[in-house]
Structures are given as C-alpha cells and as structure tokens.
C-alpha cells in the first residue's frame, strides 16, 4: 500500500477547521475490516485518531478530529481537525496498514492575521521640531511572530532606535508592540507595517505630524 500526502504544509487559520489530506489506493475487493489507519503526532507518536479493527476508534486529541467515514473505502484517509489552535501546529503522520503498510507525514502551519495597528505618541501635545518623540505601533492577536517595518513619509526605512516586543497570550497568539524613537522634523509621516510571514498579510498604521493637531 502506498500512502500519499500533500508535500506543502497545510496552512490553517486559528479557530477554523483544517483538513490534513492523506490517501491510499485500495486493491479490488478491499474492505474496511482490513484497514488499520492511524494518525499520530510525528515526533512523539501520540495517537490523534484511528480506524482499526473495522471501526472508527475515535479522537484521542481533544475530541476535535474526525475522519471521512464514507470516503475511507475509496482510499481517502484524510483527517479533519476542528477549531484549530496554535498548539496544533506541527507534523502529523498518516499510517495505513492493510496487508503491508506505509506512512507519510504532513505539516500543519497555524496562522492568525494581525489587527490593524494602533498608533500612540508620547508626548502627544506641545510638539516642536527637534523634540524627541516616542511612537508606539501596536497590533494584536496574530500568529506566528510578526515582522515589523518602519518608514518615513518618503518610504525610507527607519531602522535605528526601534524596539519591538512580541508577547504570546494564553492562546499562543502574539501581541506586537514596536516603539520608534525619532527627532521631529518640521512635519512628517511615520508608518508602521506589521507583516504576518506565513499569510503574507500586511497590516498598516501611520501617524502624520504637522505641527498641531496630529492625524492618525
């Protein structure tokens, strides 16, 4: 028996359902009574879901997995993972045994888009050219860790005096806070771009300082 899985990682958004595709080619006369299908975590061999001894043995993984029972006899051994969490990320092995056996691994990459950044200024009043100002760009609830880029109004990257921190919350999602310290010119726009490297999604925020008032 030959097992086939997708070579590319499966990308799944947090809180959505993902399908880890796996298939095999059943011989003529194949019956489910002959099938041993096991999905397990590749590294630890911890059981995720199995169909053995003629029946679906159920989910051993947070009760969030399911097979496609009507498609098994056609060789579709795919696994549905519901309400994906950050902790689901990793490699899963699809193990199929009929008379002989084969297995293959598929990677699950979890992602969550970052929110539109909010911009704050410190100090936020009585600003004069030549003042040192701290601009903070905050974006929330993304995964994996973001890449943060700062640019001025002319699109020139600002790399000096940037401090970025990323903190994971209890769900494993990251809140990003990036701080830019600059000396104000006569006027200027400062843009922050928060990129999710897996989704290739960019979230933009900017602040324009034109004497007073400030525009965000």
């Amino acid at each position: 028996v030959e097992v086939q899985v997708s070579e590319d990682p499966v990308v799944a958004l947090v809180d959505t359902d993902a399908t880890l595709r796996c298939s095999f080619s059943p011989e003529p006369g194949f019956s489910l009574a002959q099938l041993n299908l096991i999905w397990q975590l590749t590294d630890t061999k911890q059981l995720v879901h199995s169909f053995t001894e003629g029946r679906d043995q159920g989910s051993a993984y947070s009760n969030r997995t399911a097979l496609f029972p009507d498609l098994l006899v056609q060789g579709n051994a795919s696994l549905r993972l519901q309400r994906v969490r950050v902790t689901d990320e990793g490699s899963y092995t699809c193990f199929v045994s009929i008379q002989d056996f084969d297995s293959a691994a598929v990677s699950l990459q979890v992602a969550a888009p970052y929110s539109k950044p909010s911009m704050t200024l410190e100090p936020n009043k009585d600003l004069r050219p030549g003042n040192m100002v701290t601009i903070t760009c905050s974006s929330y609830q993304g995964y994996p860790e973001a890449e943060v880029f700062w640019k001025d109004g002319q699109g020139v990257p600002l790399t000096g005096n940037v401090t970025t921190s990323q903190m994971a919350n209890e769900r494993g999602l990251f809140d990003v806070h990036s701080v830019l310290r600059v000396v104000l010119g006569a006027n200027g726009t400062y843009s922050c771009l928060v990129r999710n490297p897996v989704l290739q999604q960019d979230a933009h925020g900017s602040v324009t300082i034109t004497g007073q008032p400030l525009t965000f």
Epitope: N36, I38, Q40, K45, S50, E53, G58, T93
Partner: antibody, heavy 115, light 107 residues
Framework: QVQLQQPGAELVKPGASVKLSCKAS????????MHWVKQRPGQGLEWIGM????????NYNEKFKSKATLTVDKSSSTAYMQLSSLTSEDSAVYYC????????WGQGTTLTVSS | DIVMTQSQKFMSTSVGDRVSVTCKAS??????VAWYQQKPGQSPKALIY???YRYSGVPDRFTGSGSGTDFTLTISNVQSEDLAEYFC?????????FGGGTKLEIK
C-alpha cells in the same frame, strides 16, 4: 489460539522502575492495539493506555502519563510497560489486553512495591 | 472523563434465577459498552461488546442491552459457575473507563 503471557509477579523497591512484559501469540501482533489495565486489590479496573505495535502510536490515560511508558518489540511479539518512581500506590495487578474490544486478557502480573 | 456507575456492589441470587446487573454512564456513550466477568483469582473475561453482542463461546444465558447512558447485563438461568464480579466498560471516548464492579453471590 490467542494467548497473552505475563510473568506472575514482580517485587521492586520504592523509587525504582520496573518493565512488565506481555508476550502475544496466536494472532497477528501488529494488527491489534495492546491495552494495559491496573487493578488494585479489592478495587476496580483502571485503563492505563494503549499502543499499536505496527505504528508505535500510543495513547495514555492522563493519570498515568508520567508513570507509564508503553513500548513493543515486533520481532518477539512482545508489549512492554515501564513504570517509574514506584510507590506503594503502584502495587497492583497489571493486565495486558488485546484490541479495541479487550477481547483477550493476559493472566496479569502482580507488582509489589516494598522495601 | 466518563464515569461508569454500577450502583449495586453485591447481588445475591440462586441457581436457576434470572439476575440483571446495571451500569449507568455519566454521558451518552452510544452502544460502545462492554461487559467483563472476573472470577476470583483470575483475569477478566470478555462477555459482551457493543452493548449487546456476545463473544463466541459465551453462553447465551448472558444478554447485554441498552444504549446511551443505561446498560444492563442479564444472566438468565444462573449457574454456580457464574459466581464472579462483573464490570462494565465504555470505549466511546478516551480515557476508557470501567464501572466499579458488581459481585454476584450464589445463595
């Protein structure tokens, strides 16, 4: 006929580890899950976990995750359960049982933890 | 975890009688229930799977019934060799769990 052979008894000291065996015969060892079950004297049965000999896949009762480690040796059709950091609470009869329906059971190994 | 409750720890019956051992699951387990017989000093022996299916070699005086949360093992025409403890078990979800057992005494 299906047989699951287990040693009758093991005596070990507190803090030590022990590896219990279950030798299967009379069926295709790699086609069935092997389960392990604990029974303390005069008490009920507790499911420890299971292992599939062909894939090596394991599933543990959370209660025993840090206590038991299940392995198999396909060449000798033998399943093993290692119990670590033993205390008197681990003194019990330990059974292996075949398959999703626990249709055949070993005779059990009586584990005594005592100094 | 699903709790399997066998409320009667002991049951007394006579040879030839009919006796029913009951088991209640704390949540719906469908028909994914098995019954085991354990005689003194022996390992458990499988009697019933999928709530009502008898293993080959098990006398037909043993009958299983029920679904959802309530299950019964009925022994009709009780024999002296039926002196044993009887356990129910759910295998609907992990961890698999057993009832506390019901000891059958023959008067």
């Amino acid at each position: 006929q299906v047989q699951l052979q287990q040693p009758g008894a093991e005596l070990v000291k507190p803090g030590a580890s022990v590896k219990l065996s279950c030798k299967a015969s009379g069926y295709t060892f790699t086609s069935y899950w092997m389960h392990w079950v604990k029974q303390r004297p005069g008490q009920g049965l507790e499911w420890i976990g299971m292992i599939h000999p062909n894939s090596g896949s394991t599933n543990y009762n959370e209660k025993f995750k840090s206590k038991a480690t299940l392995t198999v040796d396909k060449s000798s059709s033998t399943a093993y359960m290692q119990l670590s950091s033993l205390t008197s609470e681990d003194s019990a009869v330990y059974y292996c049982a075949r398959g999703g329906y626990f249709d055949y059971w070993g005779q059990g190994t009586t584990l005594t933890v005592s100094s | 975890d699903i709790v399997m409750t066998q409320s009667q720890k002991f049951m007394s019956t006579s040879v030839g009688d009919r006796v029913s051992v009951t088991c209640k699951a704390s949540q719906n387990v469908g028909t994914n229930v098995a019954w085991y017989q354990q005689k003194p000093g022996q390992s458990p022996k499988a009697l019933i799977y999928s709530a009502s299916y008898r293993y080959s070699g098990v006398p037909d005086r043993f009958t299983g019934s029920g679904s959802g949360t309530d299950f019964t093992l009925t022994i009709s025409n009780v024999q002296s060799e039926d002196l044993a403890e009887y356990f129910c078990q759910q295998y609907n979800s992990y961890p698999y769990t057993f009832g506390g057992g019901t000891k059958l005494e023959i008067k």
